[in-house]
Interface confidence: medium
């Protein structure tokens, strides 16, 4: 049977915008790395479309992605982590669009967790601590963290603090008394690796003490 009947479909497909973006996560599952790609246009018809990565792989020349609804995903130990890989959108054997990408420049860290805030009455401050799985990793160890906090009533008025450690002190006098605050944290690779902000950690909520009228300080 002739394959010509499908050629019109391919020609139509070439008119579509197959722009895509990807991010990598290193040692996301033990020693396994992951790579996630998605089309930038959410309306792209992804039927019969596949993603393939070639080059800068250990032991194999190419790997195919698995499709999970509208995203394409690989989990493997086979990323070399040096040099550029060629990532292509394919229909059958035909490549529709390709990008050369160094996986170390599109790293998205895992979200921080265990965020908590402890009020120190004697010091009149709040100690913010959180954890990150990257402390135990071989590759993406060095991160910059972005701690964002706001008064719960100020919907878009976030204050951001960048830090490289997992501990931050907020001075009581810089916060409104008797107010409910929301705080969250995210991370981005620093040093050798480059990439994107992680997802935000789950938010933590804390209340500041009221002002003690006699001393002018918060309770």
């Amino acid at each position: 049977e002739s394959g010509y009947a499908q050629n019109g479909d391919l020609e139509d497909a070439e008119l579509d915008d197959y722009s895509f973006s990807c991010y990598s996560q290193l040692e996301v599952n033990g020693s396994q790395h992951s790579l996630t790609c998605a089309f930038e246009d959410p309306d792209v018809n992804t039927t019969n479309l596949e993603f393939e990565i070639c080059g800068a792989l250990v032991e194999v020349k190419c790997l195919n992605f698995r499709k999970l609804q509208e995203i394409y995903f690989i989990e493997t130990k086979k990323f070399l982590l040096i040099g550029k890989s060629n990532i292509c959108v394919k229909v059958g054997e035909k490549s529709l669009t390709c990008k050369k990408i160094d996986l170390t420049t599109i790293v998205k860290p895992e979200a921080p967790f265990d965020l908590s805030v402890i009020y120190r009455e004697g010091a009149n401050d709040f100690v913010v601590t959180f954890n990150t799985s990257h402390l135990q990793k071989k590759y993406v160890k060095v991160l910059m963290h972005d701690v964002a906090y706001r008064q719960e009533k100020d919907e878009n008025k976030w204050t951001h603090v960048n830090l490289s450690s997992t501990k931050l002190t907020l001075l009581q006098r810089k916060l409104q008394p008797a107010a409910m605050y929301e705080i969250k944290v995210r991370s981005i690779p620093d040093h050798y690796f480059k990439g994107f902000w992680s997802e935000w950690s789950p938010s933590y909520y804390f209340r500041t003490p009221e002002i003690n009228n006699s001393s002018g300080e918060m309770d």
């Epitope: 800068a56 040099g83 480059k194």
Partner: antibody
Framework: EVQLVESGGGLVQPGRSLRLSCAAS????????MHWVRQAPGKGLEWVSG????????GYADSVKGRFTIFRDNAKNSLYLQMNSLRAEDTALYYC??????????????WGQGTTVTVSS | AIQLTQSPSSLSASVGDRVTITCRAS??????LAWYQQKPGKAPKLLIY???SLESGVPSRFSGSGSGTDFTLTISSLQPEDFATYYC???????????FGQGTRLEIK
Amino acid sequence: EVQLVESGGGLVQPGRSLRLSCAASGFTFDDHAMHWVRQAPGKGLEWVSGISWNSRGIGYADSVKGRFTIFRDNAKNSLYLQMNSLRAEDTALYYCAKDEYSRGYYVLDVWGQGTTVTVSS
Amino acid sequence: AIQLTQSPSSLSASVGDRVTITCRASQGASSALAWYQQKPGKAPKLLIYDASSLESGVPSRFSGSGSGTDFTLTISSLQPEDFATYYCQQFNSYPLWITFGQGTRLEIK
């Protein structure tokens, strides 16, 4: 034709400096990591230093760490090795080599013909 | 760092012989191993990568095998142009380094 041409070698006194250059042609230079490998007279191959395509990944052999600096200029398709505090044991033929990670992992698939460095008083 | 030990350091053989050179790594490194041939006064030439993949243009009498810590280069029927020094090589990607075996010199008997 893929080609690497080294230059900058010569006779130098111990403690002095020298800069080696490697001119690349025939391939997309900024897609590839590059390396310097040396071979002392009558001896085997010794990897000296390597640099990733974007200069963020750099490595050195312990024997040259702190004395040699590798760098590249992708706009000029050139690789360099700045050699300071040279010692007699640095005397060797220095090769520039291109890596070909698409083969599956680091392999040096193209080599220059080398430039000779002699360190002697 | 991983150390590579080649054996033998040198060997004599005749045209038509089958020759085997081994390379042992001080720690396991999957199949990430390459073999090079170097003739006097010439730059090294890539023969085998990924332990067993033949580089384009290299005669099929050359073959590689092995994984983990033990690797082998075999020349099934020696030709006059095969007399040279052979090196194995491994790498690490982070931090970046490459290491070579000490070489095996193959001479005419």
